[in-house]
Interface confidence: low
Amino acid sequence: SSSPTSSASSFSSSAPFLASAVSAQPPLPDQCPALCECSEAARTVKCVNRNLTEVPTDLPAYVRNLFLTGNQLAVLPAGAFARRPPLAELAALNLSGSRLDEVRAGAFEHLPSLRQLDLSHNPLADLSPFAFSGSNASVSAPSPLVELILNHIVPPEDERQNRSFEGMVVAALLAGRALQGLRRLELASNHFLYLPRDVLAQLPSLRHLDLSNNSLVSLTYVSFRNLTHLESLHLEDNALKVLHNGTLAELQGLPHIRVFLDNNPWVCDCHMADMVTWLKETEVVQGKDRLTCAYPEKMRNRVLLELNSADLDCDPILPPSLQTS
């Protein structure tokens, strides 16, 4: 993922501050919280691997880059970063590996310049639909977020709520249409079996989408048509068997796209013919010469680019009377 950005957005929040939501004592300008390291020159505060159980209340108002990694935060409540005066310059917030399992509605409210948020490597069993929008209105105030890093946020299976993890994450991404300005979204290593069909259409500003190391079997119902700004699409290390004509045409129609498809179990039968033809012609697939067949057994490790139509056959389906056990 990207390094923290140093440019603060000019977006400002009009939400009123509630006394209960902000720390009572305004911090001294040069104060540094206990267990943290601060650099006013670099506008950076690092509270790393300190087993913190809550966000420090006395963060300096100058902070632009905040690292709260490797802690034991468990829950991020509403207004977790609300302060008086507000942390008006905070642009990059890294909370990775901090044992967060619950992020509540409005957790990131009152951060008017927050452009980059990293929640990776937290077992998020309960991610509120309004974690990023801060409001249950059908259309929320736009979030200033430009980069959202959510790699490996899937909790162990025995700690998940009894619902679709994919659905929970997508609900948070789409709530209130708050993330219309999002340019980078990383969702790698989350065991996703599918991508809900409406998610990409509602994130029209995306430049970079990372879905690598999931369990995606098919993209048949996923539309990339609206993602005219998309520059990179990472689909490595999934369970993709073939890309069908509709998907191929949509990808080919994106003007700036680079697609990464390594390490998928491609099935090289008659259904693969269109994809092989497309691969031979397209420039959008990076490392296309590395793509190899996984199935059927007779085709294993064959390079897709070296196949021709005669190689790509489907065994005839025998009528029931001719099938043997």
Epitope: G97, P123, H152, S189, H191
Partner: nanobody, 120 residues
Framework: EVQLVESGGGLVQPGGSLRLSCAAS????????MSWYRQAPGKERELVAS????????RYADSVKGRFTISRDNAKNTLYLQMNSLRAEDTAVYYC?????????????WGQGTLVTVSS
């Protein structure tokens, strides 16, 4: 082929210590969270401890908090469980687990287990 091989079990007196190891191969060890489970005779398998990819986040069953420590060495592809102040109720077969994908697709892997017996 994914392989998880536990070692370090044995007979120990109450109050004693053991260190279990799990050598992993066949997958990118550093990319996956890892766990230790245990199963006592006649009981269901239970989660003992888990650790995230870089080791920045750990969690423990209430019954072992403060006594057991899970850790990993990504350079050696090895998972560890340091067990101190052992009690008779810790007697069980301990299993190393790698959840490489959804369990409902059979994408979690288990070692063969190592027996820990706490007895005087």
């Amino acid at each position: 082929e994914v392989q998880l091989v536990e070692s370090g079990g044995g007979l120990v007196q109450p109050g004693g210590s053991l260190r279990l190891s799990c050598a992993a191969s066949g997958f990118t060890f550093s990319s996956y969270a890892m766990s230790w489970y245990r199963q006592a005779p006649g009981k269901e398998r239970e989660l003992v401890a888990s650790i995230t990819t870089a080791g920045g986040s750990t969690r423990y069953a209430d019954s072992v908090k403060g006594r057991f420590t899970i850790s990993r060495d990504n350079a050696k592809n090895t998972l560890y469980l340091q067990m101190n102040s052992l009690r008779a109720e810790d007697t069980a077969v301990y299993y190393c687990n790698a959840e490489l994908g959804p369990r409902r697709l059979g994408m979690d892997y288990w070692g063969q287990g190592t027996l820990v017996t706490v007895s005087s």
